[in-house]
Interface confidence: low
């Protein structure tokens, strides 16, 4: 979790002088409770937005938006603490809106936004907005939380972000797998425009079962520049196991930007259709 870099963080708006500060996620009002505290945020909305850094990189960001309730408690509102919790790691990042002037009611409902929390593909977050000062220990809560899931790199808008492109999201290998005679598979895929090696991982399964009956790994050396975007054809020999007929082919690239952690692509070959007439049951059990 981090903030979008090199960006002037602004929270001022007409009628309000405001500054954005880093926060330890432990506001002073927890330690020194106040008697009068504001009510909670209203209509908290979290959306997936995309923002460029000054270097031109594109990142997914959490766009946080909320409004104030139209009650007298805004007279005691001194700011807000925005917290983003990454659920699988429990990592938390906070910022604080510090109001440098008193809020007054005006003809429109007060609305606040913040779009500088950088989020990761395929991660889940809990976003909380706390109005400050926080309530006394037994006081009514004055925060709102919402859960937010960032889609993975297969999502069209995500695909072109820097973190997704770094993991090879733009590479479409267009894998084809063909069953040949003599227990062989021909795997064909499109190479990317980088001189890096690939690995083909073959896993075979019995019909309708999920435990593998054959596994094989095939290394493909780095292509030369003239081979970029060309098709690579590989013939894999299968073990002659009766019923070991469903094959999953996975291609793992080793691009320089993601090394061992690049997006993998896969294709599956189903078992051939069973004949309508049942095969005679052998009078012995094959040992495999």
């Amino acid at each position: 979790l981090r903030l979008l870099d090199h960006r002037a963080l602004v929270c001022s708006q007409p009628g309000l002088n405001c500054t954005v500060k880093n926060s330890t996620c432990l506001d002073d009002s927890w330690i020194h409770p106040r008697n009068l505290t504001p009510s909670s945020p209203k209509d908290l909305q979290i959306q997936l937005h995309f923002a460029h850094t000054q270097q031109g990189d594109l990142f997914p960001v959490a766009h946080i938006e909320w409004t104030l309730q139209t009650d007298a408690s805004i007279l005691y509102l001194e700011g807000a603490e925005l917290s983003v919790l990454q659920l699988n790691t429990n990592e938390r990042l906070c910022v604080r809106f510090e109001f440098l002037s008193k809020l007054r009611h005006h003809h429109r409902r007060w609305r606040f936004t913040f779009s500088h929390f950088v989020v990761d593909p395929d991660q889940e977050y809990e976003v909380t907005v706390h109005h400050l000062p926080k309530p006394i220990p037994d006081g009514d809560p004055n925060h709102q939380s919402k859960n937010f899931l960032v889609p993975d790199c297969e999502h069209a808008r995500m695909k072109v972000t820097t973190p997704c492109m770094s993991s090879g999201s733009l590479w479409d290998p267009n894998i084809t797998v063909e069953t040949l005679e003599a227990h062989q598979l021909r795997v064909s895929f499109t190479l990317w425009n980088e001189s890096t090696h690939y690995q083909i991982l073959l896993t075979s399964f019995p019909h309708m079962e999920n435990h593998s009956c054959f596994e094989h790994m095939h290394h493909i050396p780095a292509p030369r520049p003239e081979e970029f975007h060309q098709r690579s054809n590989v013939t894999l020999t299968l073990r002659n196991l009766k019923g070991c007929c469903r094959h999953q082919v996975q291609i793992q690239p080793f691009f320089s930007s993601c090394l061992n952690d690049c997006l993998r692509h896969s294709a599956t070959v189903s078992c051939p259709e069973m004949p309508d007439t049942p095969e005679p049951i052998p009078d012995y059990m094959p040992l495999w």
Partner: antibody
Framework: QVQLQESGPGLVKPSETLPLTCTVS????????WSWIRQPAGKGLEWIGR???????IYNPSLKSRVTMSIDTSKNQFSLTLSSVTAADTAVYYC???????????????????WGQGTTVTVSS | DIQMTQSPSSLSASVGDRVTITCRAS??????LGWYQQKPGKAPKRLIY???SFQSGVPSRFSGSGSGTGFTLTISSLQPEDFATYYC?????????FGQGTKVEIK
């Protein structure tokens, strides 16, 4: 092994409010989303809405004006109230565990994998 | 809302038959689809999630396939305990919606 158990009145009068509670045992309510689904006799299934541990809710637009959900993590329970009931609300009501999240109108979730056995609710005077 | 259209609405089959149930979405839903089995008086039970992934403990004769708008649940060899109603559920868009169900009856 997570188990869900619905409880509530079997009979409710028209225009009254239906309260239902689902108790989660064998696991923590803090780890998933929790939903309600209903099924009128001989008919299909309708998703009512879901609640998360933080109290965030999403309701089916067709029922939104009448539905309220709440959660009590200390009791490992979540609840449904359906107001202004009519005979059309007569159904078996199920609670279920659901694992999903939202993002900018894109909803990524993985369906309901654990269900309660259901409780029959009849709306009649 | 996304409409899920299941076909057929009912079918009669014999033990040992291969049964195929289809579900069509009114718009693309990637592979965000599950298949559920419901017996009279019981809660639905999930068989397949993510269009083709097996729910643990479900017999391997059940399989799912499809992506986008067309999906299929196949029972390779119908067993006596498989006579039930089957529903598809899309969980790609809010709100989640079920198909109207396919009742599998004994011929």
């Amino acid at each position: 092994q997570v188990q869900l158990q619905e409880s509530g009145p079997g009979l409710v009068k028209p225009s009254e409010t239906l309260p239902l509670t689902c108790t989660v045992s064998g696991g923590s309510i803090r780890s998933y989303y929790w939903s309600w689904i209903r099924q009128p006799a001989g008919k299909g299934l309708e998703w009512i809405g879901r609640i998360y541990r933080s109290g965030n809710t999403i309701y089916n637009p067709s029922l939104k004006s009448r539905v309220t959900m709440s959660i009590d993590t200390s009791k490992n329970q979540f609840s449904l109230t359906l107001s202004s009931v009519t005979a059309a609300d007569t159904a078996v009501y199920y609670c279920a565990r659901e694992n999903y999240s939202e993002s900018s109108g894109l909803y990524y979730y993985y369906g309901m994998d654990v269900w309660g056995q259901g409780t029959t609710v009849t709306v009649s005077s | 809302d996304i409409q899920m259209t299941q076909s057929p609405s009912s079918l009669s089959a014999s033990v040992g038959d291969r049964v195929t149930i289809t579900c069509r979405a009114s718009q693309g839903i990637r592979n965000d689809l599950g298949w559920y089995q419901q017996k009279p008086g019981k809660a639905p039970k999930r068989l397949i999630y993510a269009a083709s992934s097996f729910q643990s403990g479900v017999p391997s004769r059940f399989s799912g396939s499809g992506s986008g708008t067309g999906f299929t649940l196949t029972i390779s060899s119908l067993q006596p305990e498989d006579f039930a109603t089957y529903y598809c559920l899309q969980h790609n868009s809010y709100p989640p919606t079920f198909g109207q169900g396919t009742k599998v009856e004994i011929k």
